[in-house]
């Protein structure tokens, strides 16, 4: 059993039919001695008397909100929350597997530019009684300062029968120098609770390799005299880290037929412009990437041939 | 993804084309080891990021676009010194710091040069004979050193009497491309940054 | 104590379906996930699938996906194996068992599939 | 496709030491803890040994299990005429938990 937060502790279970679970001794918060009465949750029941109190936990009937009274005033309470331990592996019941870029992805996390900042988001089904805490530091054994807010509700979908909820959260890295060369990870650790069920989920990376940057902005067309071909040129997005020159953007150019079975035509350039023949009612995109280092590419960027 | 390859302009400074050939044979390379060696830890998430450079150069700091020089995060280190006299500082009014970087960026490429030789003679002798450095990238460390031409010291290519351990040396290998390759993002983005100024 | 009594077993010509039971006992069954493993006669263990405490996620082996629904009825207490297009390959004493460091197995129950 | 490689058969007299084998990679044994198994004739396996080296209650400690790295054994010390039988390790990859990862088994015959 270990504390989570002031008057919430966690027990862990192995987790199995008939497993003999942990026995637990809450201690009433109080220099009281004697006619002290302890009760779980909203039931009136006494479960036992005295300045301590011993509980078989073997399953989630037996945690919750344990509480020691005298002459019918309440003294302090004792939140218990269970962690299962299934085979070895601890339950992951609270989060979906996003299985992207790999299965057993939980928590996602995305960075627009080297400055430290990135977000993160996970998928749940369950929309009540749910709770998640987030910290993050850079290393784990000599950890040095990431500051991460609180958990928002970003967005709600339907996925089939059910309704699917994403949750997300901000992090900035205290001292953080775009240029630095990472050789310690970012760790990231999410406190889940659902009702009486506690998880943890964990991520680590490097900046770098989360690095997606926003699409280029101020996308146009110019056409070219006498030709089927426009100059389309972009600016690299305000979001990315500057100089431009030191931390340099490549871009792929793509011109897409109104139907998606019509044939992409596609350019890399590193430059901030491109000719490209323009069909009609066709469009013209195009998505950023690092040049250097190959991470995420942006999302496309589009305006209309016509 | 193959890097678009830039043909240089005449007048370009002189590192950038040798960078960008750096960059892509490093990666190429760590590639090529982390599918040749599918059973050991060469992953990016497997690996001990270790850098041979560190406390020797300090081409993050040494080369830090001014925009950088602001940020209190990006000075923790910047006393390190270098000979200066390098041919791609060529017909360029370079400050003392842009010497330090180029100097500093070299003794990177000649510390990692020694390392990937020695490395190399070991994994010639492995009865195995499962991965060996490209002579590609060898020889575009040795390009891009020609190119920033400093005068330093030869350093010797380590020698070991005892029998190699083929798994350590492998994952060394891995260890060592990785942090080459985080090592030739930062040249190459130096060399851009110098490039456009 | 935990048991889990297994029935629905048999033959069953190839292409045919069937369903297989587990009657769960003597433990909160609506608590624990469940697996299903078979044995192909003088081969080795193969797992089959697994259904989460709740029902919410459910896992196949390549070799069944597409043709096994896993199910549960807990308030029934009952794990279930629904399976279709069957195939020779798919002759085998089919186990349930339970999901945990200590596990619980079914008695076993033979499908032969054959014409 | 099985994952987990065990020696097809091994034999020993009573009272001898007999080990099995179950050689895995990285991603199932080398992040996962191991079981072994204990199938006698007609029966429904039993658990000898779960969490690489745990041996539950009413398993004699005749039986023991350990890992290391991407491996792991059983050893039956002092071998009986009733511990013939196939043996099976089992493990997760991380892949693809909660799917049973199950060794090739090993048949163990007791000679004499």
């Known amino acids: 059993i270990w504390e989570l937060k002031k008057d919430v502790y966690v027990v862990e279970l192995d987790w199995y039919p008939d497993a003999p679970g942990e026995m637990v001794v809450l201690t009433c918060d109080t220099p009281e001695e004697d006619g002290i009465t302890w009760t779980l949750d909203q039931s009136s029941e006494v479960l036992g008397s005295g300045k301590t109190l011993t509980i078989q936990v073997k399953e989630f009937g037996d945690a919750g909100q344990y509480t020691c009274h005298k002459g019918g005033e309440v003294l302090s309470h004792s939140l218990l929350l269970l962690h299962k331990k299934e085979d070895g592996i601890w339950s992951t019941d609270i989060l979906k597997d996003q299985k992207e870029p790999k299965n057993k992805t939980f928590l996602r996390c995305e960075a627009k530019n080297y400055s430290g900042r990135f977000t993160c988001w996970w998928l749940t089904t369950i929309s009540t009684d749910l709770t998640f805490s987030v910290k993050s530091s850079r290393g784990s054994s000599d950890p040095q300062g990431v500051t991460c807010g609180a958990a928002t509700l970003s967005a709600e979908r339907v996925r089939g029968d059910n309704k699917e909820y994403e949750y997300s959260v901000e992090c900035q890295e205290d001292s953080a120098c775009p240029a630095a060369e990472e050789s310690l990870p970012i760790e990231v650790m999410v406190d889940a609770v659902h009702k009486l069920k506690y998880e943890n989920y964990t991520s680590s990376f490097f900046i770098r390799d989360i690095i997606k940057p926003d699409p280029p902005k101020n996308l146009q067309l110019k056409p070219l005299k006498n030709s089927r071909q426009v100059e389309v040129s972009w600016e690299y997005p305000d979001t990315w880290s500057t100089p431009h020159s030191y931390f340099s953007l490549t871009f792929c150019v793509q011109v897409q037929g109104k139907s998606k079975r019509e044939k992409k035509d596609r350019v890399f350039t590193d430059k901030t412009s491109a000719t490209v023949i323009c069909r009609k009612n066709a469009s013209i995109s195009v998505r950023a990437q690092d040049r250097y280092y190959s991470s995420s590419w942006s999302e496309w960027a589009s305006v209309p041939c016509s | 993804r193959n890097l678009p390859v830039a043909t240089p302009d005449p007048g370009m400074f002189p590192c950038l084309h040798h960078s960008q050939n750096l960059l892509r044979a490093v990666s190429n390379m760590l590639q090529k080891a982390r599918q040749t060696l599918e059973f050991y830890p060469c992953t990016s998430e497997e690996i001990d990021h270790e850098d041979i450079t560190k406390d020797k150069t300090s081409t993050v700091e040494a080369c830090l676009p001014l925009e950088l020089t602001k940020n209190e995060s990006c000075l923790n280190s910047r006393e390190t010194s270098f000979i200066t006299n390098g041919s791609c500082l060529a017909s360029r009014k370079t400050s003392f710091m842009m010497a330090l970087c180029l100097s500093s960026i070299y003794e990177d490429l000649k510390m990692y040069q020694v390392e990937f030789k020695t490395m190399n003679a070991k994994l010639l002798m492995d009865p195995k004979r499962q991965i060996f450095l490209d002579q590609n990238m060898l020889a575009v460390i040795d390009e891009l050193m020609q190119a920033l031409n400093f005068n330093s010291e030869t350093v010797p290519q380590k020698s070991s009497l005892e029998e190699p351990d083929f798994y350590k040396t492998k994952i060394k290998l891995c260890i060592l491309l990785h942090a080459f390759r985080i090592r030739a993002v930062t040249i190459d983005r130096v060399m851009s940054y110098l490039n456009a100024s | 104590q935990v048991q889990l009594v297994q029935s629905g077993g048999g033959v069953v010509q190839p292409g045919r379906s069937l369903r297989l039971s587990c009657a769960a006992s003597?433990?909160?069954?609506?608590?624990?996930?469940m697996h299903w493993v078979r044995q192909a006669p003088g081969k080795g263990l193969e797992w089959v699938a697994f259904i989460r405490y709740d029902g919410s996620n459910k896992y196949y082996a390549d070799s069944v996906k597409g043709r096994f629904t896993i199910s549960r009825d807990n308030s029934k207490n009952t794990l279930y194996l629904q399976m279709k297009s069957l195939r020779a390959e798919d002759t085998a004493v089919y186990y349930c068992?339970?999901?945990?460091?200590?596990?619980?197995w079914g008695q076993g129950t033979m499908v032969t599939v054959s014409s | 496709s099985y994952v987990l490689t065990q020696p097809p058969s091994v034999s020993g007299t009573p009272g001898q030491r007999v080990t099995i084998s179950c050689s895995g990679g990285r991603s199932n044994i080398g992040s996962n803890t191991v079981k072994w198994y204990q199938q006698l004739p007609g029966t429904a396996p039993k658990l000898l040994i779960y969490g690489n080296d745990i041996r539950p209650s009413g398993v004699p400690d005749r039986f023991s299990g350990s890992k290391s790295g991407t491996s792991a054994s059983l050893a039956i010390t002092g071998v009986q005429a009733e511990d013939e039988a196939d043996y099976y390790c089992q493990s997760y990859d991380r892949g693809t938990h909660p799917a049973l990862l199950f060794g090739t088994g090993t048949k163990v015959t007791v000679l004499g």
């Open positions: 068992k339970t999901h945990g460091s200590h596990d619980n």
């Open positions: 003597g433990f909160t069954f609506s608590s624990y996930g």
